[in-house]
Interface confidence: medium
């Protein structure tokens, strides 16, 4: 059974991940971002199901395309360069889902825009955090 300290650590990691994802979304949604139209043409795979930490495998697998789109944007709205943002997210995701578990991600048939993709994972983080508090 998870201890209160491990639950607290998980909660903090999820909050960190949530902040990173929200920062990216805010940078993209900034009305001054001239590349938003181009960024919205890129398609992201969405998880069929995202209710447990192991489902973060689906986010991990989409971090490379996410980094590519952020590279293209190279927006001044981001305080961190894309590589550092992705590195931060990747490390948190690996810790949360556990690197030993081999979970095969199942994706929904419909692809999504970067905004829909980020909103989906933001909702996921918020949902898990609410069950921990």
């Amino acid at each position: 059974a998870p201890t209160s300290s491990s639950t607290k650590k998980t909660q903090l990691q999820l909050e960190h991940l949530l902040l990173d994802l929200q920062m990216i979304l805010n940078g993209i949604n900034n009305y001054k971002n001239p590349k938003l139209t181009r960024m919205l043409t890129f398609k992201f795979y969405m998880p069929k199901k995202a209710t447990e930490l192991k489902h973060l495998q689906c986010l991990e697998e989409e971090l490379k395309p996410l980094e590519e789109v952020l590279n293209l944007a190279q927006s001044k709205n981001f305080h961190l360069r894309p590589r550092d943002l992705i590195s931060n997210i990747n490390v948190i995701v690996l810790e949360l889902k556990g690197s030993e578990t081999t979970f095969m991600c199942e994706y929904a048939d419909e692809t999504a825009t970067i905004v829909e993709f980020l909103n989906r994972w933001i909702t996921f983080c918020q949902s898990i955090i609410s069950t921990l508090t």
């Epitope: 590279n71 293209l72 590589r83 590195s87 990747n90 690197s99």
Partner: antibody, heavy 124, light 106 residues
Framework: EVQLVESGGGLVQPGRSLILSCAAS????????MHWVRQAPGKGLEWVSG????????GYADSVKGRFTISRDNAKNSLYLQMNSLRAEDTALYYC?????????????????WGQGTTVTVSS | DIQMTQSPSTLSASVGDRVTITCRAS??????VAWYQQKPGKAPKLLIY???SLERGVPTRFSGSGSGTEFTLTISSLQPEDFATYHC????????FGQGTKVEMK
């Protein structure tokens, strides 16, 4: 089919120059960083140089800095390596390789497509 | 340049064995490590990128782990076609390869 074909290798005397070329096809060349990697006979791999998709960022291994120059012509889907002041230790099979990540400006990722290499022999 | 030290340099194993190759960076490279397989007379083939992400089309018996300075490539059950040389590479600052690990038949 994604393909990289190197050319320009050969036998050259120490101190002389050589230009290697790499012709790319089957992918959007100007989206990706590109690299030169070499392998001396019976040895491991050595990264030589890399260039970002828009030529805005260029890097070299310490062993070739100041002697080698990487460049690309996106209109011709071509990558080049100008090798000056060649030394015996530059003798190797030179591979052209495509980076994995699109639009990387400051850095490199991993190399997912490689050519078959062109041999450079530096000897008197 | 960041140094990448691979161990062992040669590894003798049999089909079905679990094989582990280690790579140590001279300074932290975060998760920016790739692993390649190379067979004699052939160009290297990308297996793992970003320390643990499996390249498309690579069998799931290959896995990578680690972050910071310590990285591992594991082959869960060695197959006849896996006898080759394996190279690690950091791409945090420029790029540097390890010296290679030859996996040979015991």
């Amino acid at each position: 089919e994604v393909q990289l074909v190197e050319s320009g290798g050969g036998l050259v005397q120490p101190g002389r120059s050589l230009i290697l070329s790499c012709a790319a096809s089957g992918f959007t060349f100007d989206d990706y960083a590109m690299h030169w990697v070499r392998q001396a006979p019976g040895k491991g791999l050595e990264w030589v140089s890399g260039i970002s998709w828009n030529s805005g960022s260029i890097g070299y291994a310490d062993s070739v800095k100041g002697r080698f120059t990487i460049s690309r012509d996106n209109a011709k889907n071509s990558l080049y390596l100008q090798m000056n002041s060649l030394r015996a230790e530059d003798t190797a099979l030179y591979y052209c390789a495509k980076d994995q990540l699109r639009w990387g400006t400051y850095y490199y990722y991993g190399m997912d497509v490689w050519g078959q290499g062109t041999t450079v022999t530096v000897s008197s | 340049d960041i140094q990448m030290t691979q161990s062992p340099s040669t590894l003798s194993a049999s089909v079905g064995d679990r094989v582990t190759i280690t790579c140590r960076a001279s300074q932290s490279v975060s998760i920016w490590v790739a692993w390649y397989q190379q067979k004699p007379g052939k160009a290297p083939k990308l297996l793992i990128y970003k320390a643990s992400s499996l390249e498309r089309g690579v069998p799931t018996r290959f896995s990578g782990s680690g972050s910071g300075t310590e990285f591992t490539l594991t082959i869960s059950s060695l197959q006849p076609e896996d006898f080759a040389t394996y190279h690690c590479q950091q791409y945090d600052t420029g790029a540097t390869f390890g010296q290679g690990t030859k996996v040979e038949m015991k």
